[in-house]
């Protein structure tokens, strides 16, 4: 059987949408499917590598590789997007490409990057990790790391980065699969949100669904141990 | 409000090092992203530009000067330093240090300069 | 190195008149940086990235271009813009400044 709530919910354009979240009920009247996961049941994506979801995974790294920073015209914020979902009239889409985008480092003042921007995250003002020396970021931002503390400034002057930011990633579903969504849609959907990420690659949605102990290595499920919890 | 001098020894004779400070504020040297740099200026020539050094110590320099050319800085007492080694009278010049900002830019700027201090180097 | 060759070396301009200089490279650079330098004065940044205002800079002032062509544009000369005006690069190092531009008053 099927429980279905209809909400209206803010979302990423900054508008109340009208939402339905379908939860899968216990036939045996009972915990939910996530929480007796999150017990330890038997559900393979947790013990071993499930194609399916690996595929799921992949894909949304390709598509958010190729995102960019949808900045809202009248400031109301900012939220990464594809660049089709992004208003050509009530807002700008900051993506660098060709020769727009900065060096990748000082040192290197030659090669620039490609990819990005990121709404909230920049190389150039994140101290912690700095990318610098051996450490600079990758020209993929599906390898960024979570930047932990940002330069103290006010103000960039980067559009991305002076934006409120109104999406961050959410994990969605026993499938682990990650939108970059506001937190009142992400509450809605039970899911959980990541108010310390920018990008969907920076969360392991899986390793969250699953609960317990974490994974050793977060993109490969080692629960072996469920075989005997349940 | 930002401020940068700089100062240096006037005159010189030729083989000696030349050692100029920038002393500034309104900023500091240990700031995440912070840098400043040296350009000289030779009477009714262009600028040249000759070092760069950043808050996490890393300097550039103009490759045709290089092995003259040192740059430090002491961020606790808001200075930046720049050392010529083996000077001569080419090296008469009006020696600028500059903040280097970035506000808004994919790359960086000279965005404060200081007054400029005259070398001459004669014999 | 990037050889940046200012033209023309010297101008003048009336009151008024509307004002262009250019700077071209040697080869293919990203963002072009304008500075203005009075008489007896320090450079003052006046364009960054090829086309943004510096803050404080008189919005009469603009700049244009990409690859290797690039332009200073003044639309109105006023006195105060009498001085000389230096291109620069941040592509790749050295730095390097263009020979300037001399603007004097007609």
């Known amino acids: 059987a099927q429980h279905v709530t209809t909400q209206l919910v803010l979302r990423n354009k900054g508008v109340y949408e009208s939402v339905k979240y379908i939860q899968q009920e216990n036939f045996w009247i009972g915990p939910s499917s996530i929480d007796l996961i999150h017990l330890g049941a038997k559900f393979s994506p947790c013990i071993r590598k499930d194609q399916q979801i690996e595929q799921l995974v992949l894909r949304e790294r390709d598509l958010e590789r190729d995102s960019g920073c949808c900045v809202q015209n009248d400031h109301s914020g900012c939220i990464q997007t594809q660049r089709k979902d992004c208003s050509e009239t009530l807002a700008t889409f900051v993506k660098w490409q060709d020769d727009t985008g900065p060096p990748m480092d000082k040192s290197d003042l030659g090669q620039k990057r490609t990819s990005g921007a990121v709404c909230h995250q920049d190389p150039r003002t994140c101290e912690e990790p700095a990318s610098s020396g051996a450490h600079i970021w990758p020209d993929d931002i599906t390898k960024w790391p979570i930047c932990t503390e940002q330069a103290k400034s006010n103000r960039t002057g980067f559009l991305h980065m002076d934006c409120q930011i109104k999406g961050r990633p959410c994990c969605i579903s026993t499938k682990g699969s990650c939108e970059i969504t506001t937190r009142e849609y992400c509450e809605f959907m039970h899911g959980y949100f990541h108010e310390e990420a920018t990008l969907c690659s920076q969360v392991h949605c899986l390793d969250k669904v699953c609960g317990l102990l974490p994974f050793l290595n977060p993109e490969v499920p080692d629960q072996f141990y469920r075989l005997w919890l349940s | 409000q930002v401020a940068l001098k700089e100062s240096g020894p006037g005159i010189l004779q030729p083989s000696q090092t030349l050692s100029l400070t920038c002393s500034f504020s309104g900023f500091s040297l240990s700031t995440f992203g912070m840098g400043v740099g040296w350009i000289r200026q030779s009477s009714g020539k262009g600028l040249e530009w000759l070092a760069n050094?950043?808050?996490?110590?890393?300097?550039y320099y103009n490759p045709a000067l290089k092995s003259r050319l040192t740059i430090s800085k002491d961020a606790s007492k808001n200075q930046a330093f720049l050392k010529i080694a083996n000077v001569d009278t080419a090296d008469t010049a009006t020696y600028y240090c500059a903040r280097i900002g970035n506000y808004g830019s994919n790359y960086w700027y000279f965005d404060v300069w200081g007054t400029g201090t005259t070398v001459t180097v004669s014999s | 190195q990037i050889v940046l060759t200012q033209s023309p070396a010297i101008m003048s301009a009336s009151p008024g008149e509307r004002v262009t200089m250019t700077c071209s490279a040697n080869?293919?650079?990203?963002?072009m940086y304008w500075y203005q330098q009075k008489p007896g004065s320090s450079p003052r940044l006046l364009i960054y990235d090829t086309s943004n205002l510096a803050s404080g800079v008189p919005v009469r002032f603009s700049g244009s271009g990409s690859g290797t062509s690039y332009s200073l544009t003044i639309s109105r000369m006023e006195a105060e813009d009498a001085a000389t005006y230096n291109c620069?690069?941040?592509?790749?190092?050295?730095?390097?400044f263009g020979a300037g531009t001399k603007l004097e008053l007609k």
């Open positions: 050094i950043w808050w996490d110590d890393d300097k």
């Open positions: 620069q690069q941040w592509s790749s190092y050295p730095l390097t």
């Open positions: 080869s293919r650079i990203s963002y």
